[in-house]
Interface confidence: low
Amino acid sequence: ALDAAYCFRNVQDNCCLRPLYIDFKRDLGWKWIHEPKGYNANFCAGACPYLWSSDTQHSRVLSLYNTINPEASASPCCVSQDLEPLTILYYIGKTPKIEQLSNMIVKSCKCS
Amino acid sequence: ALDAAYCFRNVQDNCCLRPLYIDFKRDLGWKWIHEPKGYNANFCAGACPYLWSSDTQHSRVLSLYNTINPEASASPCCVSQDLEPLTILYYIGKTPKIEQLSNMIVKSCKCS
């Protein structure tokens, strides 16, 4: 799996999970989230050569096509596969609210 | 929806469905498929600016992050959303076989 266990331990130019810390205020301009101040969102990036963690038959076809036609703009892309929620604390007036924001943290990647 | 109805009628630099005909023999080196000789596979390509057909909360966060940090390599990618199968005819010896290859045709796209 293209997850932290593999990707963070290997120097990998191909599609893999990359670490990314997002500070809500600085990076997103969000001032409404009280806690946490930021989180490890991570992201997916890297090349998608033939058969590198292809998601569908179409992405396998596309990566093979791209091998034969390397200048064509038709190629698979490295995107998130498994995502996890993030629990946040914010205030409505003086009332604290705890909420779970779905699909906020990328745990693994795929070529799609 | 970023499908043929919208994308093929508009000049769109942002994430959209793009037409792509794949010839099995020429483009993939596949000689085993008897019919069809090729098919309209299509592909997804284009920029993913903030809120352009974002797939998940993470992709929305990432596109906003990318707006504020344009030099960062962390940005969503335009990938396939809805896929359809393709029916093919091939031979095992002299015996014709009809099979449906799943997820071969892209029908719409998303920013993920």
Epitope: P70 | F8, R18, Y21, G46, A47
Partner: antibody, heavy 125, light 112 residues
Framework: EQQLQESGPGLVKPSETLSLTCTVT????????VNWIRQPAGKGLEWIGY???????YYASWANGRFTISKDSSKNQVSLKLSSVTAADTAVYFC???????????????????WGPGTLVTVSS | EAVLTQSPGTLSLSPGERATLSCQSS????????LSWFQQKPGQPPRLLIY???TLTSGVPDRFSGSGSGTDFTLTISRLEPEDFAVYYC????????????FGGGTKVEIK
């Protein structure tokens, strides 16, 4: 209409660095490969290299590290830099895109279309 | 490194005559058909006539035709018109080669 236009200094001194720009209109550099090709006066065409839609640059073996191709998709510009120029680099420099067939790029077919009109570069002191 | 050799260097013919131009590659072009033909007139950029060895570009008169496969290719102009007198170049596309593309030296078709 899809067009390319080269620009740069007409005259460069020997040993200097030549910088050329190819400005494109009517299509996105995020989706297409752009090639640089040159033609010395009265001679044939020489493929220098290309920058792919994804930003990867490839060069002809004879380009021997003196050429650098880059792009700025937001400005719709592709640039060519040539270091330590000599009189042998005097030529008309063209940028050309891979053509499209049925809405899809043709890849390695050597099908260059459209082309820019070209810009003449003279290396002389 | 692939080398494309065009012959003859100069072809002297009269309007209405048939022109046959040859292009030979030192190694097979990719897919046996990644070969294009260009026409160039003084002070102008080259114009793509034929790609894929035999496919005419839109707007090119059908007196032009291309044939060949692998390493040997031919451009034929069935009946020369006054506007056909120009220099013709072939170009090959190569896969896995250090040079993706190569141009032939050109054939000048001049009025006899």
């Amino acid at each position: 209409e899809q067009q390319l236009q080269e620009s740069g200094p007409g005259l460069v001194k020997p040993s200097e660095t030549l910088s050329l720009t190819c400005t494109v209109t009517g299509f996105s550099l995020s989706s297409y490969t752009v090639n640089w090709i040159r033609q010395p006066a009265g001679k044939g065409l020489e493929w220098i290299g290309y920058i792919s839609y994804g930003g990867s640059a490839y060069y002809a073996s004879w380009a021997n590290g003196r050429f650098t191709i880059s792009k700025d998709s937001s400005k719709n510009q592709v640039s060519l830099k040539l270091s330590s120029v000599t009189a042998a680099d005097t030529a008309v420099y063209f940028c050309a895109r891979h053509m499209q067939v049925g809405g899809a790029p043709t890849g390695s077919m050597a099908a260059f279309d459209p082309w820019g009109p070209g810009t003449l570069v003279t290396v002389s002191s | 490194e692939a080398v494309l050799t065009q012959s003859p260097g100069t072809l002297s013919l009269s309007p209405g005559e048939r022109a046959t131009l040859s292009c030979q590659s030192s190694q097979s072009v990719y897919n046996n058909n990644y070969l294009s033909w260009f026409q160039q007139k003084p002070g102008q950029p080259p114009r793509l006539l034929i790609y894929g060895a035999s496919t005419l570009t839109s707007g090119v008169p059908d007196r032009f035709s291309g044939s060949g496969s692998g390493t040997d290719f031919t451009l034929t102009i069935s009946r020369l018109e006054p506007e056909d007198f120009a220099v013709y170049y072939c170009a090959g596309g190569y896969s896995g080669s250090s040079d993706k593309y190569a141009f032939g030296g050109g054939t000048k078709v001049e009025i006899k």
